[in-house]
Interface confidence: medium
Amino acid sequence: ELCDDDPPEIPHATFKAMAYKEGTMLNCECKRGFRRIKSGSLYMLCTGNSSHSSWDNQCQCTSSATRNTTKQVTPQPEEQKERKTTEMQSPMQPVDQASLPGHCREPPPWENEATERIYHFVVGQMVYYQCVQGYRALHRGPAESVCKMTHGKTRWTQPQLICTGEMETSQFPGEEKPQASPEGRPESETSCLVTTTDFQIQTEMAATMETSIFTTEYQ
């Protein structure tokens, strides 16, 4: 079930998905001056079975100049960007798929793709928010939004994140402070260990941790 609307927009914040639920579609958009190849896919689709998920279809772009037409498929201008976009992640970094069954990783870039990716999310998708550079988080979280189905309609939960300029006051007059709701707290899944000087390898919460320390002298 596709989500009807877009994840909430938070001023001075961007969102990203860590992985994409099966059923998610990614538009095959090309950068200015390029277009989808003739009979090329309109979108990539995250599909899979219980053990493996992957993107079906391949996006391919070709130079618009190779065809005698003025029509181009290009991303919208910066000031009229479609929503449901995430910036390309570069370099592509793999997501721990084993812990996310039924999800696809970020698809690798294709040649001459648009600078913004347009996704069509499905119910259950979670996206994460962070303040853009130069802004700091007020109400430090939970800065995620989930597409949920309620009474036959889809809606995105509201992330509790406000991004404010460093020089701005930390109070917003007349603004109600959202109360955090701790019920959605996930159980601990990850152990994090820093190094020790004697290079111990410890086990904590059933997870083994590798540790290391590096020192460098300034030349």
Partner: antibody
């Protein structure tokens, strides 16, 4: 003094990318001090004003490892350095590393 | 930055006592307040998050309350393993800041 140290924090047993990894230090006999943090999925770090320009926090999603590098070390940087995980900067730092003792001496 | 002030800075108590530690924020932080316990040579351990929610695996003798600027950590019946240093921490805004700590010692 004057050198730099890079400490790594490797997580295993679950999803790494969407959690915030914070670095907190504790000087001998002193309290806890937040240095900065990173959410690996975004890659950009936040730093406490006090450490701005001297600390660099990075993360490598492919190895589920976060790094904290502190440069221009001085004697007052002698401390135990912890990494801690928090679910998106709200629920508190629920999983901590065991700590690395960094001693700065000439 | 938001300042967090804990009181008392040290406290002597006996096993079985009811102990209360308070934490005050320099501005309203809603319920964005966490409590940690730290024993010598060990990493801090999260006890309470969101002012009053008990972290998984933490004994129910620990409880937290408060909202806005004033918060309390209560240990209903002190156990031998509870002697440690306790810290409050606000997660309302960046940077997160900690109280100076309350050292709980045996009487």
């Amino acid at each position: 003094p004057g050198s730099s140290v890079k400490v790594s924090c490797k997580a295993s047993g679950g999803t790494f990318s969407s959690y915030a990894i914070s670095w907190v230090r504790q000087a001998p006999g002193q309290g806890l001090e937040w240095m900065g943090g990173i959410i690996p999925i975004f890659g950009t770090a936040n730093y406490a004003q006090k450490f701005q320009g001297r600390v660099t926090i990075t993360a490598d999603e492919s190895t589920s490892t976060a790094y904290m590098e502190l440069s221009s070390l001085r004697s007052e940087d002698t401390a135990v350095y912890y990494c801690a995980r928090e679910m998106y900067y709200y629920y508190g730092m629920d999983v901590w590393g065991q700590g690395t003792t960094v001693t700065v001496s000439s | 930055d938001i300042q967090m002030t804990q009181s008392p800075s040290s406290l002597s108590a006996s096993v079985g006592d009811r102990v209360t530690i308070t934490c005050r924020a320099s501005q309203s932080i809603s319920n964005y307040l966490n409590w940690y316990q730290q024993k010598p040579g060990k990493a801090p351990k999260l006890l309470i998050y969101a002012a009053s929610s008990l972290q998984s695996g933490v004994p129910s003798r620990f409880s937290g309350s408060g909202s806005g600027t004033d918060f309390t950590l209560t240990i209903s019946s002190l156990q031998p393993e509870d002697f440690a240093t306790y810290y409050c921490q606000q997660s309302y805004s960046t940077p997160p800041t900690f109280g100076q700590g309350t050292k709980l010692e045996t009487k």
